[in-house]
């Protein structure tokens, strides 16, 4: 269990306890209960409340981070009498030994790498270990392969990313055997952590007016379909004097994607280039390698 | 240019089944997410179902569950829906449709109808 | 009934703006999620005129326009033209119906 937890009760204790692998929140069940409520403060002061039927004692929170400290409170009223219980859940460990400046991006449609750094007063035998676990099916991924720095892990390559679903909750634990490490925990998105490839098949058609530009969306982990991306073409005059503006032109995602601009004969040489960006984010791939069209004596 | 073509108009008798095809052209079936689309003067447009990525599977809204069924026939680009236990009130004019984002699904290519009457 | 409520017509003069509002709850557009708009001339298809709450699709004029607001949405369109008397109908994803919901429609008349 990833941190110590501090009960504050009344005498007759609804024994609340809290399981940090299912995020479930449950205590003794209280006959003829009339009300109940579960709710969690974090440190900056934010409530979190689950929905909750009456008859059930115990309450799963979806969607939180607990490294910062959070407290749980439970209220329970029966026919009888009124129970109220609160449970502290510290980060425990020492300060600053927790791993720090984590991040994760998925690439190539299929590959993710997560990274972070060692603590500033963690110990140098610290060992960090990584575990994902999916909004829907709760099931816990483990790190497969570790990147390791003077083998202390910081950070972890997933080749499977099956398990995940659209937002996930990531964990990094820590262990020495000099003194108690601090988690890190956090929720990400898997299409705010995409980096697209560039889009493929590109290709340029050009005839005595005009040139045809086409080229395929990109493969992407997320599913997404034809209408939730955003392409930029760079079609750039080859040869031309440092400092010329190159012309980006935007174009929306389409079933067909194309982009038909005039261009007569004789046709100077020139390059295109297109980048993906999911519509809604418009987080940019990379650009494509650069296709040539057009004559050096045009 | 991608194009939806559907099949004839129907007349069916309460309890009867129906089952209307949406050919496409000018693009695989295979890469496209089709749905399924009625719309009613009363009710006005309801959707059915269709092909969701996300799930990787055809799912259908909770109300007609049990009695729709959507298939496709990749080879011949065609989809299909077919509407059981039918009733005066499911007379309407059905649309097939190409989901161009999700989610959300913004129905974007449409094919122009199919108007089935369910009448004793 | 409609998930989405819309107002069942609108006019305006030939060259005016008008506004069609669409409101839903937080299990659709608030939820959020994005906002399409279509156009229904009679005896015709519906056609995308937007996606993504206020993106067009090539071949839409831009006095056409749309935005989002918590839980509702509006479309405008500004010039107003004789062709665009039609049927206009919002339409959004609904987490609590597992569903695409639409509005009930709005019928805008060019006066």
């Known amino acids: 269990e990833k941190s110590d937890l501090r009960t504050v009760a009344p005498a007759s204790s609804l024994n609340v306890r809290f399981d940090s692998r299912t995020m479930n929140l449950s205590w003794d069940c209280q006959e003829n209960t009339t009300f109940s409520k579960c709710f969690l403060t974090d440190k900056k002061n934010r409530v979190v409340e689950p929905r909750l039927s009456n008859n059930e004692c115990s309450c799963t929170f979806r969607e939180i981070c607990l490294h910062e400290g959070v407290t749980f409170e439970v209220h329970v009223n029966t026919s009888q009498r009124g129970f109220q219980q609160k449970l502290l859940y510290p980060n425990s460990g020492r300060e600053g030994t927790a791993a720090q400046n984590f991040s994760c991006f998925i690439y190539n449609a299929d590959l993710m790498n997560c990274t972070w750094a060692r603590g500033p007063t963690a110990p140098r035998d610290v060992q960090y270990f990584l575990y994902i676990r999916n909004s829907k099916r709760r099931r816990e991924i483990r790190c497969p392969y570790y990147i390791q720095d003077s083998g202390t892990h910081v950070g972890c390559h997933l080749d499977n990313l099956s398990g995940l679903t659209s937002r996930n909750y990531f964990l990094v634990n820590g262990t020495s055997r000099e003194i108690g490490i601090q988690f890190f925990d956090s929720l990400l998105d898997t299409k705010k952590i995409e980096r697209f490839n560039p889009p493929s098949n590109v290709t340029v058609r050009c005839n005595t007016t005009h040139c045809l530009v086409r080229w395929k969306q990109p493969r992407t982990y997320q599913k997404l379909s034809y209408l939730d991306f955003q392409y930029q073409l760079d079609v750039h005059r080859k040869n031309t004097q440092p400092g010329t503006e190159n012309l980006l032109i935007n174009v929306s995602g389409d079933l067909e994607n194309r982009y038909n601009f005039p261009s007569s004969e004789p046709r100077a040489k020139h390059s295109v280039k297109i980048r993906a960006a999911d519509v809604r984010i418009l987080n940019w791939s990379s650009w494509s390698e650069a296709i040539e069209f057009g004559s050096d004596d045009g | 240019q991608v194009q939806l073509v559907q099949s004839g108009a129907e007349v069916k008798k309460p309890g009867a089944s129906v089952k209307v095809s949406c050919k496409i052209s000018?693009?695989?079936?295979?890469?496209?997410?089709i749905h399924w689309v009625r719309q009613t003067p009363t009710k006005g447009f309801e959707w059915m179902g269709g092909?969701?990525?996300?799930?990787?599977?055809?799912v259908y809204a909770q109300r007609f569950q049990g009695r729709v069924t959507m298939t496709e026939d990749t080879s011949i680009d065609t989809a299909y829906l077919t509407l059981s236990s039918l009733r005066s009130d499911d007379t309407a004019v059905y649309y097939c449709?190409?989901?161009?984002?999700?989610?959300?699904?913004?129905?974007?290519?449409w094919g122009k109808g199919t108007m089935v009457t369910v009448s004793s | 009934q409609a998930v989405l409520t819309q107002p069942s017509s609108v006019s305006g003069a030939p060259g005016q703006r008008v506004t069609i509002s669409c409101t839903g709850s937080?299990?659709?557009?608030?939820?959020?999620?994005?906002v399409s708009w279509y156009q229904q001339l009679p005896g015709t298809a519906p056609k995308l005129l937007i996606y993504?709450?206020?993106k067009r699709p090539s071949g839409v004029p831009d006095r056409f326009s749309a935005s989002k607001s918590g839980t509702s949405a509006s479309l405008a369109i500004t010039g107003l033209q004789a062709d665009d008397e039609a049927d206009y109908y919002c339409?959004?994803?609904?987490?609590?119906?597992?569903?695409?919901?639409f509005g009930g429609g709005t019928k805008v008349t060019v006066l």
């Open positions: 449709s190409i989901a161009g984002s999700i989610p959300g699904w913004a129905f974007d290519y």
């Open positions: 000018g693009h695989s079936l295979s890469e496209l997410s």
């Open positions: 092909f969701d990525p996300e799930e990787n599977e055809i």
């Open positions: 937080g299990s659709n557009i608030g939820a959020p999620y994005d």
């Open positions: 993504h709450n206020n």
């Open positions: 339409q959004s994803y609904d987490s609590q119906l597992i569903s695409a919901a």
